[in-house]
């Protein structure tokens, strides 16, 4: 009878597995090939994180991950002779990295950042429970277009929250927004446990408010034309147009996904301008319009942060009360 294929020989474990941190939140594991691997073996390395996440089989003797170092993270690595996931790898070797030491109750909480109009990032946090009220905080940040880690200079206070803002301008490089900003907050005296965050540049984007350029009536329709905030193209934004009528005391809100200026009533070919027609508006009454915008999922991961409202603009006549 024809016997099955001979069982694959298990490879020896990898050697010299080590771990280091680059920038603020880039964790890199490196290792050496196993000693005494069989000569007819084309070495591949199987690796996964401690919770069996992100399995990977690759020929490189390194693996990196961008992760906020707020908790311990471990990588297990083994060697094998093929890319076949069903092949049993060598004994797995594990190497872990722990967050910086310190009382967890001293670490800041709610560390969050918002990228304002793709021009500056504003981060805020709450002090840790177990800290002195006069703690002086420092925020460090890094992203790919920076050569080194930078310290944020503009620390401020908003109520119970501390914050810091730094310039971050969208680079024309098409891959810029596929990256993240790495953030760390600690205190000057080194008494608190540092806190980390990673802010993807496709999320937490808050545009500036739009600017209403023109309101005009055509029959019983109100034509609204506005300028979008700088740095955004109109197809990447959603809009909310609010119209308040002083006579009827109605308050209409229109959620606008596309705001093209295709109607002949609109001024044409004005760059970065959007338009919307509000139907059934009484021209002989006072109508007040304001608009806000937010990023949409066509261009961004996040669509939750509305801009502030634009300045109001009014059209029509206020009727005399009799």
């Amino acid at each position: 009878g024809g016997g099955g294929a001979a069982p694959t020989e298990t490879q020896p474990p990898v050697t010299n597995l080590s771990v280091s941190v680059e920038n603020l939140c880039t964790v890199i594991w490196t290792w050496n090939p196993p000693e005494g691997a069989s000569s007819n073996c084309s070495l591949w390395y199987f690796s996964h994180f401690g919770d069996k996440q992100d399995k990977k089989i690759a020929p490189e003797t390194r693996r990196s991950i961008e992760v906020p170092l707020n908790e311990r993270i471990c990588l297990q690595v083994g060697s094998q002779c093929s890319t076949n996931e069903s092949e049993k790898p060598s004994i797995l070797v594990e190497k872990c990295i722990s967050p910086p030491e310190g009382d967890p109750e001293s670490a800041v909480t709610e560390l969050q950042c918002i990228w304002h109009n793709l021009s500056y990032m504003k981060c805020s946090w709450l002090p840790g429970r177990n800290t002195s009220p006069d703690t002086n905080y420092t925020l460090y940040y890094w992203h790919r277009s920076l050569e080194k880690i930078h310290q944020c200079e503009n620390i401020f206070r908003e109520g119970q929250y501390f914050g810091c803002s730094f310039d971050l301008t969208k680079v024309k490089d098409s891959s810029f927004e596929q990256h993240s900003v790495q953030i760390m907050v600690k205190d000057n005296a080194g008494k608190i446990k540092p806190s980390f965050n990673i802010v993807p540049l496709t999320s937490r984007v808050k545009p500036d408010p739009p600017h209403i350029k023109n309101l005009s009536f055509h029959n019983d329709d109100l034509y609204v034309q506005w300028e979008n905030p700088q740095n955004f193209i109109s197809r990447c934004l959603f809009y909310e147009v609010e119209v308040n009528n002083s006579q009827t005391e109605t308050h209409n809100v229109f959620y606008v996904q596309e705001a093209k200026c295709e109607n002949p009533e609109f001024e044409r070919n004005v760059e970065n301008t959007s338009c919307f027609m509000v139907p059934g508006v009484l021209p002989d009454t006072l109508n007040t319009v304001r608009i806000r915008v937010k990023t949409n999922k066509l261009c961004y991961e996040d669509d939750k942060l509305w801009s502030n409202w634009s300045q109001e603009m009014s059209i029509g006549k206020k009727r005399n009360s009799t």
Partner: antibody
Framework: EVQVLESGGGLVQPGGSLRLSCAAS????????LTWVRQAPGKGLEWVST????????YYADSVKGRFTISRDNSKNTVYLQMNSLRAEDTAVYYC???????????WGRGTLVTVSS | EIVLTQSPDFQSVTPKEKVTITCRAS??????LHWYQQKPDQSPKLLIK???QSFSGVPSRFSGSGSGTDFTLTINSLEAEDAAAYYC?????????FGQGTKLEIK
């Protein structure tokens, strides 16, 4: 003037529910945590629950965990305390307090009385 | 949880007298201790924050001291309007806790 004002108290049977509201004014609402503290008749103060300014951090006393839910609507400058499965020992005046700095209460409301009785 | 024990529970004093109320924490809380005054049928009011810092608008006769586990609220030259319950409160760790209160009565 900075102030907080509680409402929604009343008489409820054991096992019943009640929702308290705390309306705030005079400060930038989403920059401050708000806390519910209660005081049973003739007794001392007992911390109940806290919600941070942005609403990401929420804490409860063990005595109410799983029964009470704190929430906030920053567009309405209001914090809520949803109280379910009420017991006689929940009878108290419920105060809403604004937190400042490292977690002290600088502004208190007048309180709203919750009575749990059959 | 951190237990705060106040003493005395009750004190009857005459105007102009100096009053001392102590608050002891079951473990060290640094300076995260605050004092409140509650007059009958009123809500509490903040007197002292961070163990020794007077809150704005509070009369200068009220002062606080201490750190770690032992804290003191002192009222120099008591006035009739100071008849109230006084509570200490720790914010060093959750759950927040209050002392059981000290009731001051004016003779």
């Amino acid at each position: 003037e900075v102030q907080v004002l509680e409402s929604g108290g009343g008489l409820v049977q054991p096992g019943g529910s009640l929702r308290l509201s705390c309306a705030a004014s005079g400060f930038t609402f989403n920059n401050y945590a708000l806390t519910w503290v209660r005081q049973a008749p003739g007794k001392g103060l007992e911390w109940v629950s806290t919600i941070s300014g942005r609403g990401y951090s929420i804490y409860y006393a063990d005595s109410v965990k799983g029964r009470f839910t704190i929430s906030r609507d920053n567009s309405k400058n209001t914090v809520y305390l949803q109280m379910n499965s009420l017991r006689a020992e929940d009878t108290a005046v419920y105060y809403c307090a604004k937190e400042e700095g490292h977690w002290f209460f600088d502004v208190w409301g007048r309180g709203t009385l919750v009575t749990v009785s059959s | 949880e951190i237990v705060l024990t106040q003493s005395p529970d009750f004190q009857s004093v005459t105007p102009k007298e100096k009053v001392t109320i102590t608050c002891r924490a079951s473990q060290s809380i640094g300076s995260s201790l605050h004092w409140y005054q509650q007059k009958p049928d009123q809500s509490p009011k903040l007197l002292i924050k961070y163990a020794s810092q007077s809150f704005s608008g509070v009369p200068s006769r009220f002062s606080g001291s201490g750190s770690g586990t032992d804290f003191t609220l002192t009222i120099n030259s008591l006035e009739a309007e100071d008849a109230a319950a006084y509570y200490c409160h720790q914010s060093s760790s959750l759950p927040y806790t209050f002392g059981q209160g000290t009731k001051l009565e004016i003779k």
